[in-house]
C-alpha cells in the first residue's frame, strides 16, 4: 500500500460522568480511550480485508463528561437510567459528519449481558455504519448512524481489559459491515471437535468471550468478508491518509510535547492548547517541566512528581506504579509471581495480568458443567476444571473429584463471567443468564422506522 | 500478536557506545510512548530513558550520556549509549503501554 492511501478512519470519542466517575481523572479516562483505541488499530492493521491493508483509526476529538456535567442540561448523557437503545439514539442524535464513527463510553450496566450496541453498516442502501452522514428518519429526527456504544459493566462487575477491547473491535466491526458470526466455520468455539473448539470464536460472535483464547482477538473469514465490501464502497468517503497528529485530541503524539485538548476544554497551565499558533500548539510552556496530559506523574504545577508517589494501584497481579521522578509517565508494575491467585480466587496471575483459570494452578483446564439435557445448571456459574483434553473428567472445584487441590470448597465464577460455552454470562445470583445478541439492535431499527413504538425518557 | 523485539546489547569496555534498537513482531500504529527499562543483577527493573510524543526524559544515571529516539517510519525505538560505566551492566527493555515485555538485550560493561 501507498502512504497515499486512505486507510485511516477518524474516531470522536465521547465519555459519559459515569465512566468518568469509575476512572476518577481525566487523564486515567484519556489513557483508557487511547488503550481502547490501540487495541482496535491492532486487530485491524493486522488483519488483510481481502487486499485491503493497514486500516487504522485514530481520535480526532474527545468529550469527557466529568462528574460536574451529570446535571448540565446540554450533556445528554446525564441521565441515571437509561436502556442501551436509548444510549445508542442519544448518541445518534448528535451531527456526527465530521467523523468516520463516534463513540460513548460508559460504566453502565445494561440488561442482559448487553455490553455494546452499534449501527450495522452495509454496502449499498442502508443506513449505519462507517461514514453514514446525518439525514432525517422517519421519527422525524435528524440522526447520525455512524455511531456506537460500550460499556465497562457487567452483572455489576467490570470486565477485565481485554474484554472491553474485544467489545469496542465487535461493535467497529458491525459499523464496519459485520453481522454476527454463524455457521460451523464461523464459531469454531460451539465445535464438537475439542482441537476447533479450544482456539474459541472469533470477534463477530454473537454471545459472550473470555478474551483470552486464540480467535478471541481475529476476525472470522465471514467477517473479513462483509467488512471487505463495505470498505470497497465506503472507505473513500470519509477515511484520511493516516500519519497526521491531531493536536487537540488529548493524546500526545508525535511532533507533540503534550496535549490537553482545544481552549474550551485545556485545563492546564502546563501545556499550550490546540487553539495556539502553529508552533506553540501541543508544546510545554517555557520552564515547564512536563503536562498532566503526558501521564500521572506529573503535577498540577507543571514538575514531575517526586520519586515516592503512587501512579498506579496495586492489583491482583502487579505491585503498585511508583513514579521515578523524572518522567510523567507512570513506570510498569512488577508483577506479582505466576499462580497468585486473582479476581477472588476464580483466576491464577500469569506475567502480571489476571488471565488463567484457578485450574491452572494444579495443571488442570477449565471446562463448562453442563450436562447436555441441562439438568445442572445450577453449576453453570461454579468454577470446573477438567484434566488437560479429558472433558469427561470435567466437575466442579466443590466436587469430591477436586477436593485435594481445593478441598471441597464450591468456587464460583464473578458475576459477569462467561458460562454454559460462552453462551451467556453469569448474574449476581450466580445464575447463567443467556445473551440475546440481536435483540437491541432489532428494538431500535423498530424504534426509528416506526416511532410510534418507542416510549420517551422522562427527566 | 504484537511482541517486542530488543537488540544491539553487547560486551564493551567502559566509555563505549552502543545502540540498542527495538523492534516488532506484529503491526501497530500511533505508537506514542515508548520507553526503555534496565535490569541490573538482582536488581528490579527501572526505566531509564522515556520518549512521549516529542519529549524525551533521561534518569539521572544516564543523563548526557543516553539519548532515545524514534525511527518514525519503521515506527521503532532505539537507545543510543555512550560513555557507557560498568554501573550501566543489565539487560536492557523496550517497553509500550499494553504490550507485553520482550526478552531483552544483554548489556555488560567491563572495567
Known amino acids: 500500500t501507498t502512504s497515499a492511501e486512505k486507510n485511516t478512519c477518524q474516531l470522536y470519542i465521547q465519555t459519559d460522568h459515569l465512566f468518568f466517575k469509575y476512572y476518577g481523572t481525566r487523564e486515567a479516562v484519556i489513557a483508557q480511550i487511547s488503550s481502547h483505541v490501540k487495541a482496535i488499530d491492532t486487530i485491524y492493521q493486522t488483519t488483510d480485508f481481502s487486499g485491503i491493508r493497514n486500516i487504522s483509526f485514530m481520535v480526532k476529538r474527545i468529550r469527557i463528561n466529568t462528574t460536574a456535567d451529570e446535571k448540565d442540561p446540554t450533556n445528554p448523557f446525564r441521565f441515571p437510567n437509561i436502556g442501551v437503545e436509548k444510549f445508542l439514539e442519544l448518541n445518534s442524535e448528535q451531527n456526527h459528519d465530521d467523523y468516520c464513527l463516534a463513540y460513548v463510553f460508559t460504566d453502565r450496566d445494561f440488561d442482559d449481558g448487553v455490553l455494546g450496541l452499534a449501527w450495522v453498516g452495509a454496502p449499498s442502501g442502508s443506513s449505519g455504519g462507517i461514514c453514514e452522514k446525518s439525514k432525517l428518519y422517519s421519527d422525524g429526527k435528524k440522526k447520525s448512524l455512524n455511531t456506537g456504544i460500550i460499556t465497562v459493566q457487567n452483572y455489576g462487575s467490570h470486565v477485565p481489559p481485554k474484554v472491553s477491547h474485544i467489545t469496542f473491535a465487535h461493535e467497529v466491526g458491525h459499523n464496519f459491515g459485520s453481522p454476527h458470526d454463524s455457521g460451523t466455520e464461523c464459531t469454531p468455539g460451539e465445535s464438537k471437535n475439542l482441537g476447533q473448539k479450544e482456539n474459541g470464536n472469533y470477534i463477530m460472535y454473537a454471545r459472550a468471550t473470555s478474551g483470552d483464547k486464540l480467535n478471541n482477538n481475529k476476525f472470522s473469514l465471514c467477517s473479513i468478508r462483509n467488512i471487505s465490501q463495505v470498505l470497497e464502497k465506503k472507505r473513500n468517503n470519509c477515511f484520511v491518509e493516516s500519519g497526521q497528529p491531531i493536536c487537540g485530541n488529548g493524546m500526545v503524539e508525535q511532533g507533540e510535547e503534550c496535549d490537553c485538548g482545544y481552549s474550551d476544554q485545556c485545563k492546564d497551565e502546563c501545556c499550550f492548547d490546540a487553539n495556539q499558533p502553529e508552533g506553540r500548539k501541543c508544546k510545554l510552556k517555557p520552564g515547564k517541566q512536563c503536562s498532566p496530559s503526558q501521564g500521572p506523574c506529573c503535577t498540577a504545577q507543571c514538575a514531575f512528581k517526586s520519586k515516592s508517589e503512587k501512579c498506579r494501584d496495586d492489583s491482583d497481579c502487579a505491585r503498585e506504579g511508583i513514579c521515578n521522578g523524572f518522567t510523567a509517565l507512570c513506570p510498569a508494575s512488577d508483577p506479582k509471581p505466576n499462580f497468585t491467585d486473582c479476581n477472588r480466587h476464580t483466576q491464577v496471575c500469569i506475567n502480571g495480568q489476571c488471565a488463567g483459570s484457578i485450574c491452572e494452578k494444579y495443571g488442570l483446564e477449565e471446562c463448562t458443567c453442563a450436562s447436555s439435557d441441562g439438568k445442572d445448571d445450577k453449576e453453570l456459574c461454579h468454577v470446573c476444571c477438567m484434566k488437560k483434553m479429558d472433558p469427561s473428567t470435567c466437575a466442579s472445584t466443590g466436587s469430591v473429584q477436586w477436593s485435594r487441590h481445593f478441598s471441597g470448597r464450591t468456587i464460583t465464577l464473578q458475576p459477569g463471567s462467561p458460562c454454559n460455552d460462552f453462551r451467556g454470562y453469569c448474574d449476581v445470583f450466580m445464575r447463567c443468564r443467556l445473551v440475546d445478541a440481536d435483540g437491541p439492535l432489532a428494538r431500535l431499527k423498530k424504534a426509528i422506522f416506526s416511532p410510534e413504538l418507542y416510549e420517551n425518557i422522562a427527566e | 500478536e504484537v511482541q517486542l523485539v530488543e537488540s544491539g546489547g553487547g560486551l564493551v569496555q567502559a566509555g563505549g557506545s552502543l545502540r540498542l534498537s527495538c523492534g516488532r513482531s506484529?503491526?501497530?500504529?500511533?505508537?506514542?510512548?515508548m520507553s526503555w527499562y534496565r535490569q541490573a543483577p538482582g536488581k528490579t527493573r527501572d526505566m531509564v530513558a522515556a520518549i512521549i510524543g516529542d519529549a524525551t526524559n533521561y534518569a539521572d544515571s544516564v543523563k548526557g550520556r543516553f539519548t532515545i529516539s524514534r525511527d518514525n517510519a519503521k515506527n521503532a525505538v532505539s537507545l543510543h549509549m555512550n560513555r557507557l560505566k560498568p554501573e550501566d551492566t543489565g539487560v536492557y527493555y523496550c517497553k509500550i503501554p499494553g504490550v507485553d515485555w520482550g526478552q531483552g538485550t544483554q548489556v555488560t560493561v567491563s572495567s
Open positions: 506484529g503491526r501497530i500504529s500511533n505508537i506514542n510512548i
